[in-house]
């Protein structure tokens, strides 16, 4: 024990100065008659030690560290011993902060564990061992006068909460509660809470259940859910209000809140939801009108709303087989009448024979948008409905009648863009109730079964834009039929392209006869192609050796042309351009040479 360190304080505020002295006893002077005392903080040598020999022969070194910026470090007093540093003594220094005032102290009463659980935020790190104690006392009034003290509650290390057990609690009586924080640099206390444990009670949530359907009870309406909850029995006598939250299981919808609901509304019909949708539901409750804490949300209940019967208008159209007029092909389209019109599971076409009250004969049941059936000979009308598990749409009557109404006139069609066609007409007199417009590929690809159709409900309409199933370079047949109260007018049809193709190639030029100043050319016209508009004209171009160009426009029926005014013994490049409304294409170039003046004409 040659040396001994003493310090002004082993624990200081972080950044504060610290003074230390190291005394080396005289009996250690064999080390060196005048030993130089060195200081080391951690691994670093510290300059600034002031050394002196005391009257009793001991050596003393005093050092002041101006700022202790380490939260923990060892300060060593050393001597040089040969080539190494010999530590004579060392002390542990700590630096940190006094405890901040604990804040956000809050408590809740758990009736299941019969304890009052209080939690707080300890504040910033002190870097020093800091103890927290939850202190409390019983009070008759509003905590101004202190009654019996309650045993301190000391949390486990590192925890910022503590439980006061039931034996230390008095329900329906106020308690003063606060947190005391303490370390080597000071003590702090949180503001005091004054509370009756029952006023911070946190109840368990009810259990949500689906309501067992009873035979006499009406089933829930579309978009509604019937549910009930089983209150947490131990909290049953506490007046509470509850709230329900729900959201669709699919999608990103946020929770929707419903409340307040009394705990006693043990069964509930929740409406205004999407039909045929799976929902997640939870409930929570709070003591009310007296104070309390919200319970946690209950475990989720998953329920599906009932669907609603389809609310759609069915636009219908039909066609008879030419070989067998009693075989009818019926087409329809559902038009939603509301934003949420209900899921459609399928369609039924049925017929009610006259004189057979109540008897309905199904003719077809399908999920498609058309069906073909044999129409009984006495049937003039069938009914079409859309259905799902909740019921059917209003029946749409389909009347099979002769074409007795007036025809529309001046049916015409024109391209709007490569994927749409405008069809226009002059309405007949009287106005029809509407029109059916059908379109599909024209010859040679025409097919009755592949036609697209649309219903135009406005009888005063004078045209319709076809946007479905229109492709460029295809010939379309468009059929328009006017619809009247109990009949229809004759169908009219027109053919059109939405976009025509330019000629794919121009005819090859052939030299038929040549002279000194002329050349007779001919070509074989290309056969007309479907999807390509007819030729409007040809243009023939020729260029001489001096790069002078000449041209002539010829009508589309031309089969040949004679070039006049050519120079003898001259070279010419000639090509033909075939043009239609959709564009033009050039032929390959024909090169020829006119005859020399002495040469004889070639035929």
């Amino acid at each position: 024990e040659c040396g001994h360190i003493s310090v002004s304080a082993p624990i200081v505020h972080l950044g504060d100065p610290i003074t230390a002295s190291c005394i080396i006893k005289q009996n250690c002077s064999h080390l060196d008659p005048e030993p130089q005392i060195l200081w080391r903080l951690g691994a670093e040598l510290q300059p600034g030690g002031r050394q002196q020999r005391l009257s009793d022969g001991t050596q003393e070194s005093i050092i002041t560290l101006p700022h202790l910026n380490h939260t923990q470090a060892f300060l060593s007093c050393c001597l040089n011993w040969g080539n190494s540093l010999q530590i004579l003594d060392q002390v542990e220094l700590r630096a940190g902060y006094p405890p901040a005032i604990p804040h956000n102290l809050s408590c809740l009463m758990n009736l299941t564990t019969s304890s009052l659980i209080c939690q707080w935020e300890p504040g910033p790190e002190t870097h020093l061992p800091t103890s927290f104690t939850l202190k409390s006392f019983k009070s008759r009034g509003n905590c101004q006068t202190q009654g019996d003290s309650i045993l301190d509650c000391v949390p486990k290390d590192g925890q910022s909460h503590c439980c006061i057990p039931r034996k230390h609690l008095l329900l329906y009586q106020n308690m003063g509660i606060w947190v005391q924080a303490e370390n080597a640099l000071g003590t702090s206390m949180s503001p005091q809470l004054c509370l009756d444990p029952m006023d911070v009670v946190k109840l368990e949530p009810p259990m949500l259940r689906t309501m067992d359907p009873s035979p006499e009870a009406a089933p829930p309406q579309a978009g509604c859910l019937q549910l009930c909850w089983e209150p947490w029995q131990p909290g049953l006598h506490i007046n509470q209000k509850c709230e329900l939250r729900h959201k669709p299981q699919r999608g990103e919808a946020s929770w929707a809140l419903v409340g307040p609901l009394p705990l006693e509304a043990l069964q509930y019909e929740l409406c205004g939801l999407l039909p045929a949708t799976a929902y997640t539901l939870q409930i929570r409750c709070i003591r009310w009108p007296l104070p309390g804490h919200w319970s946690d949300w209950s475990p989720s209940l998953e329920l599906r709303t009932t669907e609603r019967a389809p609310t759609v208008r069915l636009d219908t159209w039909w066609r008879q087989r030419q070989l067998d007029p009693r075989t009818v092909q019926l087409f329809w389209k559902p038009v939603p009448l509301e934003e949420d019109s209900g899921r459609i599971q399928g369609y039924v076409v049925s017929w009610r024979p006259s004189g057979q009250a109540g008897a309905i004969l199904p003719l077809c049941n399908t999920t498609e948008l058309s069906c073909t059936f044999h129409l009984p000979s006495e049937a003039q009308e069938v009914a079409l409905v859309a259905y799902n598990s909740a019921g059917t749409s209003r029946p749409t009557p389909v009347v099979f009648s002769e074409s007795r109404g007036p025809a529309l006139t001046r049916l015409h069609a024109m391209a709007r863009d490569p994927h749409s066609l405008w069809v226009g007409w002059e309405p007949p007199n009287p106005w029809p109730q509407g029109y059916v417009i059908e379109w599909g590929l024209g010859p040679p690809s025409a097919s009755n079964s592949n036609k697209t159709w649309r219903m135009e409900q406005n009888g005063r309409a004078t045209g319709f834009l076809l946007k479905e199933n229109i492709r460029p370079f295809q010939l379309y047949e468009i059929i328009v039929t006017p619809l009247y109260q109990d009949t229809m007018g004759p169908s009219q049809h027109v053919y059109a392209y939405s976009q025509e193709m330019a000629p794919s190639h121009a005819p090859e030029l052939h030299l038929k006869h040549i002279g000194k100043t002329w050349a007779q050319l001919e070509w074989v016209p290309e056969p007309p192609e479907l999807g390509k508009s007819p030729l409007t004209h040809y243009t023939i171009f020729w260029t001489n050796a001096q790069n002078q160009s000449f041209s002539a426009i010829l009508n589309a029926s031309s089969r040949g042309f004679v070039l006049h005014g050519l120079e003898p013994a001259s070279l010419y490049h000639i090509h033909l351009m075939a043009a239609s409304q959709a564009g033009a294409t050039n032929s390959t170039v024909l090169t020829l040479m006119t005859l020399t003046p002495e040469g004889s004409e070639l035929h």
């Epitope: 009736l111 019969s114 131990p234 049953l236 506490i238």
Partner: antibody
Framework: EVQLLESGGGLVQPGGSLRLSCAAS????????MGWVRQAPGKGLEWVSS????????PYADSVKGRFTISRDNSKNTLYLQMNSLRAEDTAVYYC???????????WGQGTLVTVSS | DIQMTQSPSSLSASVGDRVTITCRAS??????LNWYQQKPGKAPKLLIY???NLQNGVPSRFSGSGSGTDFTLTISSLQPEDFATYYC?????????FGGGTKVEIK
Amino acid sequence: EVQLLESGGGLVQPGGSLRLSCAASGFTFSLYWMGWVRQAPGKGLEWVSSISSSGGVTPYADSVKGRFTISRDNSKNTLYLQMNSLRAEDTAVYYCAKLGELGFFQEWGQGTLVTVSS
Amino acid sequence: DIQMTQSPSSLSASVGDRVTITCRASQGISSYLNWYQQKPGKAPKLLIYYASNLQNGVPSRFSGSGSGTDFTLTISSLQPEDFATYYCQQSYAYPQQFGGGTKVEIK
């Protein structure tokens, strides 16, 4: 001061009916559960039925289920017990009680005697 | 249903004695146990609720303890006015049940 005053007790033949009433005062009646507890001569206490503050929840002891009906009129601060199909074993002093939030019987009436005998 | 078993069914004691009555539930009831005192010809009176909370106006010689299934009512120093029948009652779940009672008589 809380007061509970029972009435309606008396002698009734087996199979008969009786309606007990309990007039409450001194507290906000509509905020509390209320209940009936009975005590047969020389026997212990037996819980009969309770009713929630708004009357929506009404549990019963198995021995009276289907025969007794508990109800309340919050506008009159009165609790009722309708007793039908009475049996000899229903003979008891019937106490009306105010329940605390944790289900204890906080305040009691003085009781009314119901005797079922032919 | 939760059954409540009280013991003893009766006991004799002298003024100044320390008296202990126990009540056992057939299943856990947390702290939902209440104690009542009844004197002959009178209505019961609440002494202790939620296992250990003394009802207002009840002398501090009465105390309650226990949780779960086993509970105790203690009278630290029996007084002449304490001779009565004592009942426990569980309020954890319906049907609410009373114990059979313990009659405290003068020795």
